[in-house]
């Protein structure tokens, strides 16, 4: 004797997040009379998705006209799919009963898998700046993707990095997944303009990976090199002492002139020049009136860079001798000057 069968022809359906899923179901008979219901999951905890007979299911539409008397197509469409909709859906035929309808036969189920794009990778560097030759860690995070398979690569200025560790969570089955990766990068003095890139490839991205970037300019601190030199000026009783501050980054820098250990003047780097590698140069001038001094003068250029402990360079100014050139300005890039007289 013939008996109604519930056919769900698709074992699995793969849908991109935000799209509409079509779950197909047909019955092979109009007998027995009774409604169809759709559930996600099986057993006592199953979730009602659609009831042909009653209820309000705003995300669900029927493919065929449900009021058509000879309708055997119980396919439904679920709109605006999210990863949370993933699961196995069952089309279940009920036999009309009193007081309640009785479950008669279920389809074999259709597994709905949701393809969700990963979020844009967010790359974050260390909290504090580090100096060249130090190794710093960068993290990259991306969330909300499905299925679990994903590829993550690190690059520094287009060169692929190999020193990194990646985890995809959770380890077991989930509606969506997250990836977390930590890469180690050795800084060099030339890294002010460098970029670290985290690249994520996933089936939903159709060969066009997502990238997150971090500029090493936010991570690196290149300490300055100091050079103090003395040049004569036309007036025989005056000497020009310059402090060349070279190759520093970031720009935040404060310079103090000390005369025999006593603060003479403090100034902040303003009109700096930028080098091709992104570092800065600055020069401060000090015009010394030699005739005002009986003894030799020790001039110190003290620089505090980016809140770090001060570094200094000293120059001994001989007042007994006739002023003559004791050094030369070798930094062609230096154009800025600060002129002061000491009397």
């Amino acid at each position: 004797e013939e008996e109604l069968q519930v056919i769900q022809p698709d074992k699995s359906v793969l849908v991109a997040a935000g799209e509409t899923a079509t779950l197909r179901c047909t019955a092979t008979s109009l007998i027995p009379v009774g409604p169809i219901q759709w559930f996600r999951g099986a057993g006592p905890g199953r979730e009602l998705i659609y009831n042909q007979k009653e209820g309000h299911f705003p995300r669900v539409t029927t493919v065929s006209e449900p009021t058509k008397r000879n309708n055997m197509d119980f396919s439904i469409r679920i709109g605006n799919i999210t990863p949370a909709d993933a699961g196995t859906y069952y089309c279940v035929k009920f036999r009309k009963g009193s007081p309640d309808d009785v479950e008669f036969k279920s389809g074999a189920g259709t597994e709905l898998s949701v393809r969700a794009k990963p979020s844009a990778p967010v790359v974050s560097g260390p909290a504090a700046r580090a100096t060249p030759q130090h190794t710093v860690s960068f993290t990259c995070e991306s969330h909300g993707f499905s299925p679990r398979d994903i590829t993550l690569k690190w690059f520094k200025n287009g060169n692929e990095l190999s020193d990194f560790q990646t985890n995809v969570d959770p380890v077991g089955e989930s509606v969506s997944y997250s990836i977390h990766s930590t890469a180690k990068v050795v800084l060099t003095r030339e890294d002010v303009h460098s970029q670290v890139i985290c690249e994520v490839a996933h089936v939903t991205l159709q060969g066009d990976p997502l990238r997150g970037t971090a500029n090493l300019s936010e991570t690196i601190r290149v300490p300055p090199t100091l050079e103090v030199t003395q040049q004569p000026v036309r007036a025989e009783n005056q000497v020009n002492v310059t402090c060349q501050v070279r190759k520093f980054y970031p720009q935040r820098l404060q310079l103090t002139w000390l005369e025999n250990g006593n603060v003479s003047r403090t100034e902040t780097a303003s009109t700096v020049t930028e080098n091709k590698d992104g570092t800065y140069n600055w020069m401060s001038w000090l015009l010394v009136n030699v005739s005002a001094h009986r003894d030799d003068v020790k001039l110190t250029c003290q620089v505090e860079h980016d809140g770090q402990p001060a570094v200094s360079k000293s120059h001994d100014l001989k007042v007994s001798a006739h002023p003559k050139e004791q050094g030369s300005n070798t930094a062609a890039e230096n154009t800025g000057s600060n002129e002061r007289n000491i009397y």
């Epitope: 004797e1 013939e2 109604l4 022809p9 079509t22 197909r24 047909t26 092979t28 008979s29 109009l30 007998i31 009379v33 493919v63 065929s64 006209e65 058509k68 008397r69 000879n70 309708n71 055997m72 197509d73 396919s75």
Partner: antibody
């Protein structure tokens, strides 16, 4: 007023595939919820239902022909098609396409096309 | 498959006669039954759906009845244009199946 028109070769060689198309005019193939069926009638015999396709793209084929039948729909051309593979002389028949509308029953039929399987 | 047994396979009646055709299903099909008329060289035409409902444009001399396994199709007053073969078809179970047909002729 919906009308159906079958088209395809009248002669097919044994072991080849019979291909027929039903063109729907006077209405959209995708509107409403009709079942689009193929039926055949052997010379001097009764009617045999081959199978149908409907809105969701779901097909159901008569088990007696299932392994050889494919019914498909092309909504852009407002057509549905029948393919029957590995034909023999026993597949010689008049082939009809039909629509089952909102009410039960195939209320619109094509005029039928005769297909002869012969070498 | 549901077997549909139609009888008689042919009959001859006079114009104005009442003609009755029966159709028996191999199991209960409720009232999921249709009746078709097919004239020579033509496609079938739906006359009755859901066992007893007259299709659009069909003369009222045609009627149908029955439920479960036994069904009857009646032409209350046979007309010359009714010469045709009549088929029952069940749609309660897939695959849909037809009866063998009843050929109606005029005496």
């Amino acid at each position: 007023q919906v009308q159906l028109q079958e088209s395809g070769p009248g002669l097919v060689k044994p072991s080849q595939t019979l291909s027929l198309t039903c063109t729907v005019s006077g209405g959209s193939i995708s509107s409403g919820s009709p079942y689009w069926s193929w039926i055949r009638q052997h010379p001097g015999k009764g009617l045999e239902w081959i199978g149908y396709i409907y809105a969701s793209g779901f097909t159901y084929y008569n088990p007696s022909l299932k392994s050889r039948v494919t019914i498909s729909v092309d909504t852009s051309k407002n057509q549905f098609s029948l393919k029957l593979s590995s034909v023999t002389a026993a597949d010689t028949a008049v082939y009809y396409c039909a629509r089952e509308g909102y009410h039960s029953g195939m209320d619109v039929w094509g005029q039928g096309t005769t297909v002869t399987v012969s070498s | 498959d549901i077997q549909m047994t139609q009888s008689p396979s042919s009959l001859s009646a006079s114009v104005g006669d009442r003609v009755t055709i029966t159709c028996q299903a191999s199991q209960d099909i409720s009232n999921y039954l249709n009746w078709y008329q097919q004239k020579p060289g033509k496609a079938p035409k739906l006359l009755i759906y859901d066992a007893s409902n007259l299709a659009t444009g069909v003369p009222s001399r045609f009627s149908g009845s029955g439920s479960g396994t036994d069904f009857t199709f009646t032409i209350s007053s046979l007309q010359p244009e009714d010469i045709a073969t009549y088929y029952c078809q069940q749609f309660a179970y897939l695959p849909w199946t037809f009866g063998g047909g009843t050929k109606v002729e005029i005496k």
